[in-house]
Amino acid sequence: YDFTNCDFQKIEADYLRTISKDLITYMSGTKSTDFNNTVSCSNRPHCLTEIQSLTFNPTPRCASLAKEMFARKTKATLALWCPGYSETQINATQAMKKARKSKVTTNKCLEQVSQLLGLWRRFIRTLLKKQ
């Protein structure tokens, strides 16, 4: 999906108001130095592509993020502020959510959420640069 036509300012506002708090709550008890940031992004659409992938695509060692509150809010803000964010995209992640049962905060999930925090910060930095 191409995130080029999103309203980046409004997405940033949603992130700062609420999504960031949920990500930080998820990470509570870990130090920012516990994980190295290995995922990066170069511009706003690219950052959203990486954020979407890391939030909603299950990985072998972390399959449960799509059920988390920050993921629900991420999906809501993309649906709201990305005009072409496809209904199939939304329905696909909905189906993935139903497929998962156990909620286990593994070290791998914490690492993934740490990467997400880094991507969101990068998204905001690229936004500030544009202004």
Epitope: K10, D14, A76, L80, P83, I90, N91
Partner: antibody, heavy 121, light 111 residues
Framework: QEQLVQSGDEVKKPGASVKVSCKSS????????ISWVRQAPGQGLEWMGM????????NYAEKFQGRVTITADPSTTTTSMELSSLRSEDTAVYYC??????????????WGPGTPITVSS | QSAPIQPRSVSGSPGQSVTISCTGT?????????ISWYQQHPGKAPKLMIY???KRPSGVSDRFSGSKSGNTASLTISGLQAEDEADYYC???????????FGGGTQLTIV
């Protein structure tokens, strides 16, 4: 069953404000958006704005920007719409409507019965 | 952005089919497949009949169908029945600022 229940008819003077409430029941309040739509006598439907409780986000139609405020009280699953600086052209039936499921906020699958508001001196 | 254009009125006999058009621009109807149709009987709240161009909510008769070509969306009602007499409104997503635009409405009369 799923329903939206709105507050009663209002008669207001020009320049005044009015607040209409919309209580949600039978569904998960935080999983949907609530929009407000009005209909002047003999006229069509007009979208005014909406609130997404999950994000605490409001979005207003340009025409109503600065004059309308939509708020929510999740504890009572109630959404309210306040319209200020009323004029005679604001005489209409005001509906609250639920945005579709699965984050598809742009269609309305459940409507309140409507609240008639009359603005007259 | 201005409201999509609908014919003021259409009519049909019981058993016939009617099509109601809704013409917008590339910024609304032409730009997205986020078109819905609502039925409104006098003094009642609107009811969702079609969403996302051609999907029917559960409980809506399959006599109602929707389509889109370019900047124009259409609602077709086949096998007209007396209870279909109502006003019909199209609605289109119109981007993150305007969000939703309703058409002017079409009065369907069963003759």
């Amino acid at each position: 069953q799923e329903q939206l229940v709105q507050s009663g008819d209002e008669v207001k003077k020009p320049g005044a404000s009015v607040k209409v409430s919309c209580k949600s029941s039978g569904f998960t309040f935080g999983s949907y958006a609530i929009s407000w739509v009005r209909q002047a006598p003999g006229q069509g439907l007009e979208w005014m704005g909406m609130l997404v409780p999950l994000l605490g986000v409001t979005n207003y139609a340009e025409k109503f920007q600065g004059r309308v405020t939509i708020t929510a009280d999740p504890s009572t699953t109630t959404t309210s719409m306040e319209l200020s600086s009323l004029r005679s052209e604001d005489t209409a039936v005001y509906y609250c409507a639920r945005g579709g499921s699965n984050y598809l906020y742009w269609y309305f699958d459940l409507w309140g019965p409507g609240t008639p508001i009359t603005v007259s001196s | 952005q201005s409201a999509p254009i609908q014919p003021r009125s259409v009519s049909g006999s019981p058993g016939q089919s009617v099509t109601i058009s809704c013409t917008g621009t590339s910024s609304d109807i032409g730009g997205y497949n986020r078109i819905s149709w609502y039925q409104q009987h006098p003094g009642k709240a609107p009811k969702l009949m079609i969403y996302d161009v051609s999907k029917r909510p559960s409980g809506v008769s399959d006599r109602f169908s929707g389509s889109k070509s370019g900047n124009t969306a259409s609602l077709t009602i086949s096998g007209l029945q007396a209870e279909d007499e109502a006003d019909y409104y199209c609605s289109s997503y119109a981007g993150t600022d305007t969000f939703v635009l309703f058409g002017g409405g079409t009065q369907l009369t069963i003759v």
